[in-house]
């Protein structure tokens, strides 16, 4: 598989980590999250051309079949390979609590 | 998250397991796999509308941000949640070997 910088479609166009700034209102969290007021959401965005960051054998198969049957089989998709934890300060019935979410921020990406 | 049958876009249009019949030639495996000659490839195909089979918090965030910034943030993507193992009989330098691949056939799907 090609490495993350070797995008055949041009620099930065293939599957990689992006940061999107989002407020609690954007996320629909304003009524239950106190802090942070704004989240730097890291997510996986970009194209998955042939064998680029292929996660596994399934992704390789998907690439082959997409080439043969593009109307039936979609190209692999850019998704998180792992996550970074994030702490949210939440409102509770009794006050405030700290909650760690392990599946909120993408850490790195692959195609599947 | 809605269950797998409750697709708001119409029956069978949302993220679910599909089977695609593929020959070794289709997969580009003809020179190293002896058997099976044909593979029933199970893969995840379909749309991921709002909160449908959302895999985790990240998927929920992605849905929210896609609604706000559809040109920047893609909708969640239908990918395997788990896999079924598959045995391939391969040609090796010394003869023939059995190899079990744990990441070849999708077992069930979710949106991420």
């Amino acid at each position: 598989a090609r490495n993350g910088d070797d995008c055949p479609l041009g620099p930065g166009r293939c599957c990689r980590l992006h940061t999107v700034r989002a407020s609690l209102e954007d996320l629909g969290w304003a009524d239950w999250v106190l802090s942070p007021r704004e989240v730097q959401v890291t997510m996986c965005i970009g194209a998955c051309p042939s064998q680029f960051r292929a996660a596994n054998m399934h992704a390789q198969i998907k690439t082959s079949l997409h080439r043969l049957k593009p109307d039936t089989v979609p190209a692999p998709c850019c998704v998180p390979a792992s996550y970074n934890p994030m702490v949210l300060i939440q409102k509770t019935d009794t006050g405030v609590s700290l909650q760690t979410y392990d599946d909120l921020l993408a850490k790195d990406c692959h195609c599947i | 998250a809605r269950n797998g049958d409750d697709c708001p876009l119409g029956p069978g249009r949302c993220c679910r397991l599909h089977t695609v019949r593929a020959s070794l030639e289709d997969l580009g495996w003809a020179d190293w796999v002896l058997s099976p000659r044909e593979v029933q490839v199970t893969m995840c195909i379909g749309a991921c509308p709002s909160q449908f089979r959302a895999a985790n918090m990240h998927a929920q965030i992605k849905t929210s941000l896609h609604r706000l910034k559809p040109d920047t943030v893609p909708a969640p993507c239908c990918v395997p949640a788990s896999y079924n193992p598959m045995v391939l009989i391969q040609k090796t330098d010394t003869g023939v070997s059995l190899q079990t691949y744990d990441d070849l056939l999708a077992k069930d799907c979710h949106c991420i």
Epitope: - | L34, P36, Q40, M86, V87
Partner: antibody, heavy 119, light 111 residues
Framework: DVKLVESGEGLVKPGGSLKLSCAAS????????MSWVRQTPEKRLEWVAY????????YYADTVKGRFTISRDNARNTLYLQMSSLKSEDTAMYYC????????????WGQGTTLTVSS | DSVLTQSPASLLVSLGQRATISCRAS??????????MHWYQQKPGQPPKLLIK???YLESGVPARFSGSGSGTDFTLNIHPVEEEDAATYYC?????????FGGGTKLEIK
């Protein structure tokens, strides 16, 4: 060690039914396809039925189609062959075999179980 | 269906000599890459045992005196030098497509 142990042998009248079982051990049963192969009294080998690892692909020899049903229980590591409308020509030694995948070979065989169809 | 015809039906070979068994398919059991023909040995009171897979690949643990060759419709099993323990019936089998079929068998006797 891979072991396949058949059971269910019997003497059955023509038109009768019988179910054969095969208990598998020593390998990950759910990862492999399985087949039944029979050997006639004249020592001819005949492939009878095939079932894929997950049970979703099933094939039969024309001689048994519509009369025999192959199935498996991966939780119990057991292969089955339900036989009905039995004929005298079904008389044979029935072997449970590991067939690996489609287009493969039989790498392990059980010791066999005998079916006799006679009035 | 591909019908497999084995010849000879029986074979008497001297110890240390070569035994050659033929298997002919009524239609090709090969692709451009591989041949889907396999060979088994069966001794009295025992189930068949795999010897050769995909026409020429020796199964693990099988002595090197066994060899297989051929493609398309014509296949051969060779045993050289023949040993006493090789007395058995030999079967070919194809798996190119369903239904899988076996040859009628060749009984090898050693003198």
């Amino acid at each position: 060690d891979v072991k396949l142990v058949e059971s269910g042998e019997g003497l059955v009248k023509p038109g009768g039914s019988l179910k054969l079982s095969c208990a598998a051990s020593g390998f990950t049963f759910s990862s492999y396809a399985m087949s039944w192969v029979r050997q006639t009294p004249e020592k001819r080998l005949e492939w009878v039925a095939y079932i894929s690892s997950g049970g979703d692909n099933i094939y039969y020899a024309d001689t048994v189609k519509g009369r025999f049903t192959i199935s498996r229980d991966n939780a119990r590591n057991t292969l089955y062959l339900q036989m009905s409308s039995l004929k005298s020509e079904d008389t044979a030694m029935y072997y449970c075999t590991r067939a690996l995948v489609e287009n493969a070979y039989f790498d392990y065989w059980g010791q066999g179980t005998t079916l006799t169809v006679s009035s | 269906d591909s019908v497999l015809t084995q010849s000879p039906a029986s074979l008497l070979v001297s110890l240390g000599q070569r035994a050659t068994i033929s298997c002919r398919a009524s239609k090709s059991v090969s692709t451009s890459t591989y041949s889907y023909m396999h060979w088994y040995q069966q001794k009295p009171g025992q189930p068949p045992k795999l010897l050769i897979k995909y026409a020429s690949y020796l199964e693990s643990g099988v002595p090197a005196r066994f060899s297989g060759s051929g493609s398309g419709t014509d296949f051969t099993l060779n045993i050289h030098p023949v040993e006493e323990e090789d007395a058995a019936t030999y079967y070919c089998q194809h798996s190119r497509e369903f239904p899988w079929t076996f040859g009628g068998g060749t009984k090898l006797e050693i003198k």
